[in-house]
């Protein structure tokens, strides 16, 4: 039925649009950039991104229309709604602070919450993290007693345990919580990299051609026989 289809008979897709046959007598147009509408008959007024502040743009009869997010207004959603013009948003003498698309309450001492509608109790909930214990020191003040390994006004900061580390023989200190570990080079092992690795045990074939492996602190050596030489008696 292709030759009698509207795509061929009436060529409905304008402005260089491509016609796609959906069924015997229905079609869909894929428009060129800059055009929109069922038959690509409208100039896409949204192409210039006229809608501001995250609003959604739609084209209707060569005109754009912006659907604003909450908190914005105007033809292009360019105007911020000042929620603070309407009194009563913030309770208990809270100060209203207008923000792009929203507002915030800055509460007086003793109150908290989005609308300053809740009483502030220093340790409820506890601001102390990492297992710290909150102690109320005044009507509006608190102190956090931190577990070992943490510091900060809310115990938020890990104490670096590496400054006084005892990693030996080129061991690298890796900080933990109230502890540290030593990352040892291959020749050393143990908590502080003080124990020698016996390479002769780890590598039975370290010495070639009948050479004898001799473990040493921080390494090993080969005692070669029958005229062989070199680090591993291979020369």
């Amino acid at each position: 039925y292709s030759t009698s289809h509207p795509c061929f008979v009436s060529r409905p897709c304008l402005n260089g649009g491509t016609c796609h046959m959906l069924s015997r007598d229905t079609y869909e147009c894929t428009c060129q950039v800059g055009f929109t509408g069922k038959e690509c008959q409208w100039t896409d007024a949204c192409l210039s991104h006229p809608c501001a502040n995250g609003s959604t743009c739609t084209t209707v009869a060569n005109q754009f229309s912006c659907k604003c997010l909450t908190g914005f207004t105007g033809q292009k959603c360019e105007t911020d709604v000042n929620e603070c013009d309407i009194p009563g948003h913030c309770q208990h003498g809270g100060t209203c602070l207008n923000l792009p698309g929203s507002y915030q309450c800055q509460c007086p001492q003793g109150f908290t919450g989005q609308y300053c509608d809740s009483l502030y109790v220093p340790c409820a909930p506890s601001p102390c993290v990492n297992g710290g214990t909150c102690r109320q020191t005044g009507d509006f003040t608190f102190e956090c007693n931190c577990l070992p390994g943490f510091e900060g006004s809310t115990c938020e900061r890990n104490i670096d345990d590496c400054p006084n580390h005892r990693c030996q023989n080129g061991g690298v200190c890796v900080d933990g919580v109230n502890t540290y570990n030593c990352r040892c080079p291959p020749q050393w092992t143990g908590q502080f990299c003080t124990e020698d690795v016996d390479e002769c045990l780890l590598q039975p074939n370290a010495c070639q051609n009948g050479g004898t492996c001799a473990n040493r602190n921080g390494g090993y050596g080969c005692v070669c026989v029958n005229g062989w030489s070199g680090d591993d008696c291979s020369e």
């Epitope: 510091e151 006004s153 938020e156």
Partner: antibody
Framework: EVKLVDYGGGLVQPGASLRLSCEVS????????MEWIRQAPGKGLEWIAA??????????VYSASVKDRFTISRDTYKSILYLQMSTLKPEDTAVYYC???????????WGQGTSVIVSS | DIQMTQSPASLSASLGETVTIQCQTS??????LAWYHQKPGKSPQLLIY???RLQDGVPSRFTGSGSGTQYSLKISSMQTEDEGVYFC?????????FGSGTKLEIK
């Protein structure tokens, strides 16, 4: 309103000393850790010193680049944070900011900065 | 010291566009990360603390995410006032360290 005002910067010669001040208001000074941060011309931010809060006996910590040359301190009665800088070097040239540590992994209030130029 | 690797160093975006800045740390900082915005001649302003929490007074188009050693800041629908330099900073342990900054310009 939380407010921090930095002052005391200026032009000094290498080897000289200078004391920066940061006057704070709008919060309980002794409850918060306070930090000094600097920014060399056209460069990034560098932390240099901290004064812990009263609960931690106002103990101090420094970056390796200023240790033994700079001293952080505070006057809790006047609500002023200080940074005493000695043996100044040309590489100490920067804008110095004091800031309040929120206790929630962020510096939530900053001074306007005071400029220190070390040049002969 | 914990090293901070921030990328990109600079980028330009059109108004309304979404922008993402990355920050990588040399060790796990357990979400102890903050993001700041600085305009020329001004002090930095805290945007995000604790990796994902929005600071009071900061527009909700700013979103922080990440954990472990990988963190990002997303600015959805770029506005004129968003131009400037963005810094990440770890507050997990002393010394506090900052990323080298990302300069954001309007295309």
């Amino acid at each position: 309103e939380v407010k921090l005002v930095d002052y005391g910067g200026g032009l000094v010669q290498p080897g000289a000393s200078l004391r920066l001040s940061c006057e704070v208001s709008g919060f309980t000074f002794s409850d918060f850790y306070m930090e000094w941060i600097r920014q060399a011309p056209g460069k990034g931010l560098e932390w240099i010193a901290a004064s812990r809060n009263k609960a931690n006996n106002f103990s101090i910590v420094y970056s390796a680049s200023v240790k033994d040359r700079f001293t952080i301190s505070r006057d809790t009665y006047k609500s002023i944070l200080y940074l005493q800088m000695s043996t100044l070097k040309p590489e100490d040239t920067a804008v110095y900011y004091c800031s309040r540590d929120s206790g929630r992994w962020g510096l939530d209030a900053w001074g306007q900065g005071t400029s220190v130029i070390v040049s002969s | 010291d914990i090293q901070m690797t921030q990328s990109p160093a600079s980028l330009s975006a059109s108004l309304g566009e979404t922008v993402t800045i990355q920050c990588q740390t040399s060790e796990d900082i357990y979400s102890g990360l903050a993001w700041y915005h600085q305009k020329p001649g001004k002090s930095p302003q805290l945007l995000i603390y604790g990796a994902s929490r929005l600071q009071d007074g900061v527009p909700s188009r700013f979103t922080g995410s990440g954990s472990g050693t990988q963190y990002s800041l997303k600015i959805s629908s770029m506005q004129t006032e968003d131009e400037g330099v963005y810094f990440c900073q770890q507050g997990f342990k002393y010394p506090l360290t900052f990323g080298s900054g990302t300069k954001l310009e309007i295309k």
